[in-house]
């Protein structure tokens, strides 16, 4: 799996999970989130060569097509596979609200 | 929806469905498929700017992060959303086989 256990341990040009810490205030200009101040969002990036973690039959076909026709602009892309939620605390007026934001943290990647 | 009805009708630099016909023999070097000779596989390509068909909360966060921090290399990618199968005819010896290959045709795209 193209997850932290594999990707953060290996130097990898191909599609892999990349570390990304987002500070809500500094990076997004959000002041309304009280806790946490930021989080490990991570992201997916890297090349998708032939059979590198292909997600579907179509992405397999596309990576083969791209290998045989290197001038082609049609190639699979490295995107998130497994995501996890993030729980945040914010206030509406003086009332604290706890919200679970779905699909906020990328845990693994795929070529799609 | 970033499907043929929208994307093939509009000139679109952003993430959209692109037409791609794949000839099995010429483009993939496959001689074993008897019918069809090729098919409209299509593919997804284009930029994923702020709020353009964002698939998850993470891709929304990433597109905002990328907008506010344009020097960042972390940005969402244009990939397939809905896929359809393709039915093929091939032979094992002289025995005809009909097979439905899943997820072979891209029908719409998303920024993920």
């Amino acid at each position: 799996a193209l997850d932290a256990a594999y990707c953060f341990r290996n130097v990898q040009d191909n599609c892999c999970l990349r570390p990304l810490y987002i500070d809500f205030k500094r990076d997004l200009g959000w002041k309304w989130i009280h806790e946490p101040k930021g989080y490990n969002a991570n992201f997916c990036a890297g090349a998708c060569p032939y059979l590198w973690s292909s997600d579907t039959q179509h992405s397999r076909v596309l990576s083969l097509y791209n290998t045989i026709n290197p001038e082609a602009s049609a190639s699979p892309c490295c995107v998130s596979q497994d995501l996890e939620p993030l729980t945040i605390l914010y206030y509406i007026g003086k009332t604290p609200k706890i919200e679970q934001l779905s699909n906020m943290i990328v845990k693994s990647c795929k070529c799609s | 929806a970033l499907d043929a009805a929208y994307c093939f009708r509009n000139v679109q630099d952003n993430c959209c469905l692109r037409p791609l016909y794949i000839d099995f023999k010429r483009d993939l070097g496959w001689k074993w498929i008897h019918e069809p000779k090729g098919y409209n596989a299509n593919f997804c390509a284009g930029a994923c700017p702020y709020l353009w068909s964002s698939d998850t909360q993470h891709s929304r966060v990433l597109s905002l992060y990328n907008t506010i921090n344009p020097e960042a290399s972390a940005s969402p990618c244009c990939v397939s959303q809905d896929l359809e199968p393709l039915t093929i005819l091939y032979y094992i010896g002289k025995t005809p086989k009909i097979e439905q290959l899943s997820n072979m045709i891209v029908k719409s795209c998303k920024c993920s």
């Epitope: 200009g29 309304w32 919200e99 934001l101 | 709020l51 905002l64």
Partner: nanobody
């Protein structure tokens, strides 16, 4: 009921100025990232400028130095001051409100035409 109402569009000569407003109702305005988008005839909708809930701003390269985005929380209103207008600025300008906790909202648009 959420409403975003744009105003301030119109016909202006090249080099002229306009100030667009987007009045929001039915939302907790201070939590929303607000953006101006535009769509020229036969072209895709594109981001012109954004101001986050905390006041961070960003502009499309084509409008940097000419347009200024701002927000007034007390009035639940966002503005776009457009100076040195060019013919390529012509299009329908849409207001967008986005907060990750809910969905995002769009206004109906206001027409800006730059012509002599």
């Amino acid at each position: 009921q959420v409403q975003l109402v744009e105003s301030g569009g119109g016909l202006v000569q090249p080099g002229g100025s306009l100030r667009l407003s987007c009045a929001a109702s039915g939302i907790s305005f201070s939590y929303y990232d607000m953006g101006w988008f535009r769509q020229a005839p036969g072209k895709q909708r594109e981001l012109v400028a954004i101001v986050t809930s905390g006041g961070r701003t960003n502009y499309a390269d084509s409008v940097k130095g000419r347009f200024t985005i701002s927000r007034e929380t007390a009035k639940s209103t966002m503005y776009l001051q457009m100076n040195s207008l060019k013919s390529e600025d012509t299009g329908v300008y849409y207001c967008n409100a986005h907060w990750i906790v809910t969905t995002d909202y769009w206004g109906q648009g206001t027409q800006v035409t730059v012509a002599s």
